[in-house]
Amino acid sequence: QQAPYWTHPQRMEKKLHAVPAGNTVKFRCPAAGNPTPTIRWLKDGQAFHGENRIGGIRLRHQHWSLVMESVVPSDRGTYTCLVENAVGSIRYNYLLDVLERSPHRPILQAGLPANTTAVVGSDVELLCKVYSDAQPHIQWLKHIVINGSSFGADGFPYVQVLKTADINSSEVEVLYLRNVSAEDAGEYTCLAGNSIGLSYQSAWLTVLPEEDPTWTAAAPEARYTD
């Protein structure tokens, strides 16, 4: 039996990582031991799973690594890898500093909102995750049809505002659709704006009838696809 030890300490010499906002950061703590140790990560001394982070994190245990894409100022802090087995434990601290960029248009997380399929009567949540260093406002829009047309004479779509708020109010990034009906099907857009400009991404909601036999075979109430 052997306590954990670093297998490539030379790869861990860079303790301070100062990176521009928007870049990807990778921390590695390659280790070994007997029995094979486990690795977990802390941020500023607290267990870190990335659930509150836009874009989440990637933990690759076989590579002893933590990856964060599109870092933002709130990602700043001390990241600790804690490697342990039954015999002992070792830890190492990385310091992350995120260098703020110039104010830019809002950046929306790729793939959100996601195309969604739901059954009549079910509830749907459409998510929109926004990064903006200037305070953004968000609007949820539904694309609608007027006189049989989705577009006006100017070539722009007809839209209906479903929800408007500033990002710092609660749940602004989620559009809740309760008890959906066939009329709720269609294209939904998350529009984020700040003092520099606007950005938006759209998704389609497909609503299936309750008695659809192909649907009942596929268990979940709401299905999310990219």
């Epitope: 104010p103 248009r105 400009g197």
Partner: antibody, heavy 124, light 112 residues
């Protein structure tokens, strides 16, 4: 008709102050970010500052930071630029420009409407 | 800051002939939403700039279809398919992706 009308320009000595105003009409002013852009005589265009639709966010070019202050009064549909510690190199035509609005961008999301400009001359 | 470099400095064109203006940015203007935030303006003598093209290739309302914008990421082009006398002026490209917003140095278009 959508219009922006600047005023307040004039001749001023270096180190002095001047306040520019921009009166907006024909659109919902309180729903749009607003910018100032300037152009020195015979030169190109230089962005100066922006203010968000509600005035909560303001950003400045490095060349004016700490000297110029952008503000707005949504109840009066006016945009202002307070210019302190003026320098000879601040001599330019100052344009008021409409920025991004709230809601679906039916066309460009800003920088589509410019005022006629007001001339500021800083000279001893 | 993003630097916008425009060429040529000036252009003398025969009426009815095409004209092309190039603009290069020091960083990509392709945003995560898939749009490329380069704008083109013309400034005629004694007037403020007028928007011609937005988001790389969209013609602003009222702009004749002889004007077109193209390019990708860092290299952009404004083309006038057949120059007319009224097209005389200084043409500017602008990046509208982050502050400070920056403009190209301008291209003066004259008629031969």
């Amino acid at each position: 008709e959508v219009q922006l009308l600047e005023s307040g320009g004039g001749v001023v000595q270096p180190g002095r102050s001047l306040r520019l105003s921009c009166a907006a009409s024909g659109f919902t002013f309180s729903s749009y970010a607003m910018h100032w852009v300037r152009q020195a005589p015979g030169k190109g265009l230089e962005w100066v500052a922006v203010i968000s639709y509600d005035g909560s966010n303001k950003y400045y070019a490095d060349s004016v930071k700490g000297r110029f202050t952008i503000s707005r009064d949504n109840s009066k549909n006016t945009l202002s630029l307070q210019m302190n510690s003026l320098r000879v190199e601040d001599t330019a035509i100052y344009y008021c420009v409409r920025g991004a609005g709230l809601g679906w961008p039916y066309g460009p999301d800003g920088f589509d409407i410019w005022g006629q400009g007001t001339m500021v001359t800083v000279s001893s | 800051d993003i630097v916008m470099t425009q060429t040529p400095l000036s252009l003398s064109v025969t009426p009815g002939q095409p004209a092309s203006i190039s603009c290069k940015s020091s960083r990509s203007l392709l945003h995560s939403d898939g749009k490329t935030y380069v704008y083109w303006y013309v400034q005629k003598s004694g007037q403020p700039p007028q928007l011609l093209i937005y988001e790389l290739s969209n013609r602003f309302s009222g702009v004749p279809d002889r004007f077109s914008g193209s390019g990708s990421r860092t290299d952009f082009t404004l083309k006038i398919s057949r120059v007319e006398a009224e097209d005389v002026g200084v043409y500017y490209c602008m990046q509208y992706i982050e502050a400070p917003l920056t403009f190209g140095g301008g291209t003066k278009v004259e008629i031969k």
